[in-house]
Interface confidence: medium
Amino acid sequence: FERTRSLQDPCSNCPAGTFCDNNRNQICSPCPPNSFSSAGGQRTCDICRQCKGVFRTRKECSSTSNAECDCTPGFHCLGAGCSMCEQDCKQGQELTKKGCKDCCFGTFNDQKRGICRPWTNCSLDGKSVLVNGTKERDVVCGPSPADLSPGASSVTPPAPAREPGHSPQ
């Protein structure tokens, strides 16, 4: 830590990891255990974040940086700096107020977090469905029928079925 000496504010000489105990002690005091200061010239140290319960410690607190948390298995981070942990669901599901629910027909979720999203509508791009969608996977669009050479077969678009994402057998 290179100090540029300040006559007007000696506290500015205090590096990260210390606080300026100006009137009482006239010195930069080290941050007490379980506290930190990430910048110089601070008059107090901040209390370290504690990763408890569903949070677990990804990076320990040091005198110059706060602890960083992530989530225990079965949960994932939400918000800046992992301020919340949200329950994981399986692929093909989304988290609702009542817990994990399967994606409705015509939607999918390929992750353990987030919401179910609608399948791609191939026809909007003038294409046809090459691979049918499922709860876990989006449809795969193929070339439009006009692009196919004569005699080539294409997959017929699926008709609605009770089982999401599957063509009638």
Epitope: P10, C14, P15, N22, N23, I27
Partner: antibody, heavy 118, light 108 residues
Framework: QIQLVQSGPELKKPGETVKISCKAS????????MNWVKQAPGKGFKWMGW????????TYADDFKGRFAFSLEISASTAYLQINNLKNEDTATYFC???????????WGQGTSVTVSS | ENVLTQSPAIMSASPGEKVTMTCRAS???????LHWYQQKSGASPKLWIY???NLASGVPARFSGSGSGTSYSLTISSVEAEDAATYYC?????????FGGGTKLEIK
């Protein structure tokens, strides 16, 4: 520029009192504490303690409790060291040194020689 | 009290030589609070290296400092005649200051 100017040499008899001054200039006196350091002839340094120039509160090292007193004259930007009931073993050079914010002594006075002899 | 022990007490070097002196603490010292002073005969000491490795204003670049925990050192990469002096380490912890006994550097 920053300077600490101490009073001149002293020759004293055992049992007498001496008062050494340390006049600071070139910085805001009340922003930085003042240390006092003893150096016996041919020896190293012993930290005697320090005085908070903002509150006037002195702190004494264990070996310098009792006969030693730190004081201030803020209007004159001056710190004082008084030694009462002088003993032969008080013969030394005494330094004032500015208390830097990271525990260093960044500016020193020129030293005041105190000789105690009967 | 954190006791600082300097070694060697006296050392001798020829101009151009590299020298290293050490300072050991009886308990751990924060590197921000470990400092070195130079004192020449009959003069007041000067802050020489502060916070383990930072050279004070006007100190030649041939000087360097390093260390952590309980072991610190001052090194002169190529000694010059003007470096003849006694070097003291000093620490601040638990609201107390302590000095090492000094290393006297003599130039041959």
């Amino acid at each position: 520029q920053i300077q600490l100017v101490q009073s001149g040499p002293e020759l004293k008899k055992p049992g007498e009192t001496v008062k050494i001054s340390c006049k600071a200039s070139g910085y805001t006196f009340t922003n930085y504490g003042m240390n006092w350091v003893k150096q016996a002839p041919g020896k190293g340094f012993k930290w005697m303690g320090w005085i908070n120039t903002y509150t006037g509160e002195p702190t004494y090292a264990d070996d310098f409790k009792g006969r030693f007193a730190f004081s201030l004259e803020i209007s004159a930007s001056t710190a004082y060291l008084q030694i009462n009931n002088l003993k032969n073993e008080d013969t030394a050079t005494y330094f004032c040194a500015r208390r830097d914010y990271l525990g260093a002594m960044d500016y020193w006075g020129q030293g005041t020689s105190v000789t105690v002899s009967s | 009290e954190n006791v600082l022990t300097q070694s060697p007490a006296i050392m001798s070097a020829s101009p151009g030589e590299k020298v290293t002196m050490t300072c050991r603490a009886s308990s751990s010292v924060s590197s921000s609070y470990l400092h070195w002073y130079q004192q020449k005969s009959g003069a007041s000491p000067k802050l020489w290296i502060y916070s383990t490795s930072n050279l004070a204003s006007g100190v030649p670049a041939r000087f360097s400092g390093s260390g952590s925990g309980t072991s610190y050192s001052l090194t002169i990469s190529s000694v010059e005649a003007e470096d003849a002096a006694t070097y003291y380490c000093q620490q601040y912890s638990a609201y107390l200051y302590t000095f090492g006994g000094g290393t006297k550097l003599e130039i041959k």
